[in-house]
C-alpha cells in the first residue's frame, strides 16, 4: 500500500494515527470520527488544548493517545462525548494539572501521565488517591511534580472536598406552608454549588436564592408529597464534589384504606395507611379490639423510600368461620385519625347446616393436646368428637 500523505492515516479497521509533525492544532473534523475506537496522536506541538467540541462525534472511542505533543490543558468536560473511553495516554505533554472532573464518569483502565510537568496542589489529590489505590496503572508511573517531588509525597491534610451543612426548619411544617432551607458551604477553592431537586416534581414551588458560600432555597406552598423526597445541596472544589441530602417532614393527618381479603400463603386483608408523622394502628374485630397473636398479626411490606404511605396485610393463619366478620383498621397521628372497615368471610360455618343434610361424623377420639391452632369444637356430653375437614 502507498504511504499515506495525510496528517492522519487509517490504522486497522477503526483506528487513526496522526503522527506527521505539527500537522494538527485541534481534533476537529477527523476523518471517519464516528466509528473510531482508537486514536493515536504524536508530535503535535500545536495541539495545546483539548476541549469538549474536539471529541464530539467520537462516541465509540475506547483508546486515546496524545503523546509528545504540546497539550497544556484538558477541559474538565473534554471526554463528555466519549463515555466508552477506557485507555487514556497523555504522556510527554505540557500538562501541569488535570481536573478530577475530566475522568469522572469514565471507567478508565489505564491513565498515563508520565513525562508531564505536573504541579502538585490539592487539584491533584484525586490522582494521588489513584496512586494510593493502585488505579489506572498510575502507581507504576511514579509520577513527579515539577520542582517539588513525587506525587506520593504531596501533603494532603488540607485537601478536602467542601463541607456542607443544610439547615432545615425545626418547627412542624404543614401542608401549604413555605419552607426556607439554607445550605452553608465551607472549604477552600470553592468552584460551584447548587441544589438537586429532581425528586420534588409537584411537591412545592421552588425559588433559589443566594450563592456561595450560602445558598437559599424556598419551597412554597408545600404538599404532603414533599415527604420522603430528597432535597440535595452539592458543592465542588478542585479536590472533588460533596453532596448532602435532607428531607422536609410535612405534617398531615392519618388516612387509611382497606381492601378485600385475599388468600395467599396465609389470608391477607390488604391495607394502606398514610400520614406524617407515621400513624399508630389498631385493629378491631366486630367492634372489639383485636389482640394480635402469632396466628393473626400485622405485616408491613417493604416501604418505598420516597413516600410516606405504608402498605401491608393483616395476616390470618388458616382462619376458620370464627374469624369471619367485620374488620376495622384505626389509624391516628397528632393531626387526625381515620378508620376503614371491611367484611371478611374466610369459610362457611359448618354448624349452619340443613337438618336434612348428612352429618359427617368421625369416630376418632378428640385430641385434647392439639397444637394445630385450628379451632376444635368439643361437646362434653358426647364421647364422640365431631371433626370438621378444612381444605
Amino acid at each position: 500500500a502507498a504511504p499515506c500523505p495525510d496528517a492522519c492515516c487509517p490504522h486497522g479497521s477503526s483506528g487513526l494515527r496522526c503522527t506527521r509533525d505539527g500537522a494538527l492544532d485541534s481534533l476537529h473534523h477527523l476523518p471517519g470520527a464516528e466509528n473510531l475506537t482508537e486514536l493515536y496522536i504524536e508530535n503535535q506541538q500545536h495541539l495545546q488544548h483539548l476541549e469538549l467540541r474536539d471529541l464530539r462525534g467520537l462516541g465509540e472511542l475506547r483508546n486515546l493517545t496524545i503523546v509528545k505533543s504540546g497539550l497544556r490543558f484538558v477541559a474538565p468536560d473534554a471526554f463528555h462525548f466519549t463515555p466508552r473511553l477506557s485507555r487514556l495516554n497523555l504522556s510527554f505533554n505540557a500538562l501541569e494539572s488535570l481536573s478530577w472532573k475530566t475522568v469522572q464518569g469514565l471507567s478508565l483502565q489505564e491513565l498515563v501521565l508520565s513525562g508531564n510537568p505536573l504541579h502538585c496542589s490539592c487539584a491533584l489529590r484525586w490522582l494521588q488517591r489513584w496512586e494510593e489505590e493502585g488505579l489506572g496503572g498510575v502507581p507504576e508511573q511514579k509520577l513527579q511534580c515539577h520542582g517539588q517531588g513525587p506525587l506520593a509525597h504531596m501533603p494532603n491534610a488540607s485537601c478536602g472536598v467542601p463541607t456542607l451543612k443544610v439547615q432545615v426548619p425545626n418547627a412542624s411544617v404543614d401542608v401549604g406552608d413555605d419552607v426556607l432551607l439554607r445550605c452553608q458551604v465551607e472549604g477552600r477553592g470553592l468552584e460551584q454549588a447548587g441544589w438537586i431537586l429532581t425528586e420534588l416534581e409537584q411537591s412545592a414551588t421552588v425559588m433559589k436564592s443566594g450563592g456561595l458560600p450560602s445558598l437559599g432555597l424556598t419551597l412554597a406552598n408545600v404538599t404532603s408529597d414533599l415527604n420522603r423526597k430528597n432535597v440535595t445541596c452539592w458543592a465542588e472544589n478542585d479536590v472533588g464534589r460533596a453532596e448532602v441530602s435532607v428531607q422536609v417532614n410535612v405534617s398531615f393527618p392519618a388516612s387509611v384504606q382497606l381492601h378485600t381479603a385475599v388468600e395467599m400463603h396465609h389470608w391477607c386483608i390488604p391495607f394502606s395507611v398514610d400520614g406524617q408523622p407515621a400513624p399508630s394502628l389498631r385493629w378491631l374485630f366486630n367492634g372489639s379490639v383485636l389482640n394480635e397473636t402469632s396466628f393473626i398479626f400485622t405485616e408491613f411490606l417493604e416501604p418505598a423510600a420516597n413516600e410516606t404511605v405504608r402498605h401491608g396485610c393483616l395476616r390470618l393463619n388458616q382462619p376458620t368461620h370464627v374469624n369471619n366478620g367485620n374488620y376495622t383498621l384505626l389509624a391516628a397521628n397528632p393531626f387526625g385519625q381515620a378508620s376503614a372497615s371491611i367484611m371478611a368471610a374466610f369459610m362457611d360455618n359448618p354448624f349452619e347446616f340443613n337438618p336434612e343434610d348428612p352429618i359427617p361424623v368421625s369416630f376418632s377420639p378428640v385430641d385434647t393436646n392439639s397444637t394445630s391452632g385450628d379451632p376444635v369444637e368439643k361437646k362434653d356430653e358426647t364421647p364422640f368428637g365431631v371433626s370438621v375437614a378444612v381444605g
Epitope: 496542589s121 490539592c122 515539577h146 520542582g147 517539588q148 517531588g149 501533603p155 488540607s158 477552600r188 470553592l190
Partner: antibody, heavy 119, light 106 residues
Framework: QVQLVQSGAEVKKPGASVKVSCKAS????????MHWVRQAPGQGLEWIGT????????SYAQKFQGRVTLTRDTSTSTAYMELSSLRSEDTAVYYC????????????WGQGTTVTVSS | DIQMTQSPSSLSASVGDRVTITCRAS?????LYWFQQKPGKAPKPLIY???TLGSGVPSRFSGSGSGTDYTLTISSLQPEDFATYYC?????????FGGGTKVEIK
C-alpha cells in the same frame, strides 16, 4: 548535615553574563529539585527557576525565560545558575535552595551570592 | 501568577507582645509557607504547609488559615524574633512570595 555553599560575590557590567554555583553536600544531590531565588536590595524574594539534578529537567519563571540557564554537574554535586544580558535591576542576592519533598518545603538555603551590575 | 499580599508591611512591638501577621492570596491556595529572614542572612523556614513548624522552630510560632487568608502568630515576642517575615504559596506556578513584614523593636 545538609549544606548548600554558594560561590562568592560578583561585579558585572550591563550586557555581561554571570554564573553562580551552589555546591550541595550531606544528601543525595540527584534526588531533590534545586531552586533559585533572588532578592534585590531592600526588596522581597523572587523565584527564578528550578532544576532536577537527576535528569536536568528545568522550569523557569516567565520573566527570566531566555535569559537564565540552570545546569548541574552530578560528579561534583553542584548546581549552576547563569544569567545573561545583565541589567542594573539584576543587582541582587541570589540564593539556591533545596525543595525537600519529604516535608514539602524549601528546607535548606545557600548563604547567598551578591551580584552587582554596574557600569 | 498568584499575588501574595502581606499586612502590615512593618510593625513595632515589644518583647512579650503577641504579634499577628496576615497573608492574603489573590486566589484560593492549597497551603502556605512562612520564612523568617534577618539582615544579611538567607531566609529560614518557619512554617510549612500552613501550620507545621519547621525543625528547631519554637512553639511560640503558629500558623493557620485556609483558602485565601492565612495568619502567622508569635504568641510572646522574643528579642531574637525581630526580623522580616515572608509568606509563600506554591499552589500554582510560579511560587510567589509576599512583600514581607518587618517586625521592629518598639
Amino acid at each position: 548535615q545538609v549544606q548548600l555553599v554558594q560561590s562568592g560575590a560578583e561585579v558585572k557590567k550591563p550586557g555581561a553574563s554571570v554564573k553562580v554555583s551552589c555546591k550541595a553536600s550531606g544528601y543525595t544531590f540527584t534526588e531533590y529539585w534545586m531552586h533559585w531565588v533572588r532578592q534585590a536590595p531592600g526588596q522581597g524574594l523572587e523565584w527564578i527557576g528550578t532544576i532536577y539534578p537527576g535528569n536536568s529537567d528545568t522550569s523557569y519563571a516567565q520573566k527570566f525565560q531566555g535569559r537564565v540557564t540552570l545546569t548541574r554537574d552530578t560528579s561534583t554535586s553542584t548546581a549552576y545558575m547563569e544569567l545573561s544580558s545583565l541589567r542594573s535591576e539584576d543587582t541582587a542576592v541570589y540564593y539556591c535552595t533545596r525543595f525537600y519533598f519529604e516535608d514539602w518545603y524549601f528546607d535548606v538555603w545557600g548563604q547567598g551570592t551578591t551580584v552587582t551590575v554596574s557600569s | 501568577d498568584i499575588q501574595m499580599t502581606q499586612s502590615p508591611s512593618s510593625l513595632s512591638a515589644s518583647v512579650g507582645d503577641r504579634v499577628t501577621i496576615t497573608c492574603r492570596a489573590s486566589s484560593s491556595i492549597s497551603w502556605l509557607y512562612w520564612f523568617q529572614q534577618k539582615p544579611g542572612k538567607a531566609p529560614k523556614p518557619l512554617i510549612y504547609y500552613t501550620s507545621t513548624l519547621g525543625s528547631g522552630v519554637p512553639s511560640r510560632f503558629s500558623g493557620s488559615g485556609s483558602g485565601t487568608d492565612y495568619t502567622l502568630t508569635i504568641s510572646s515576642l522574643q528579642p531574637e524574633d525581630f526580623a522580616t517575615y515572608y509568606c509563600q504559596q506554591w499552589h500554582s506556578y510560579p511560587p510567589t512570595f509576599g512583600g514581607g513584614t518587618k517586625v521592629e523593636i518598639k
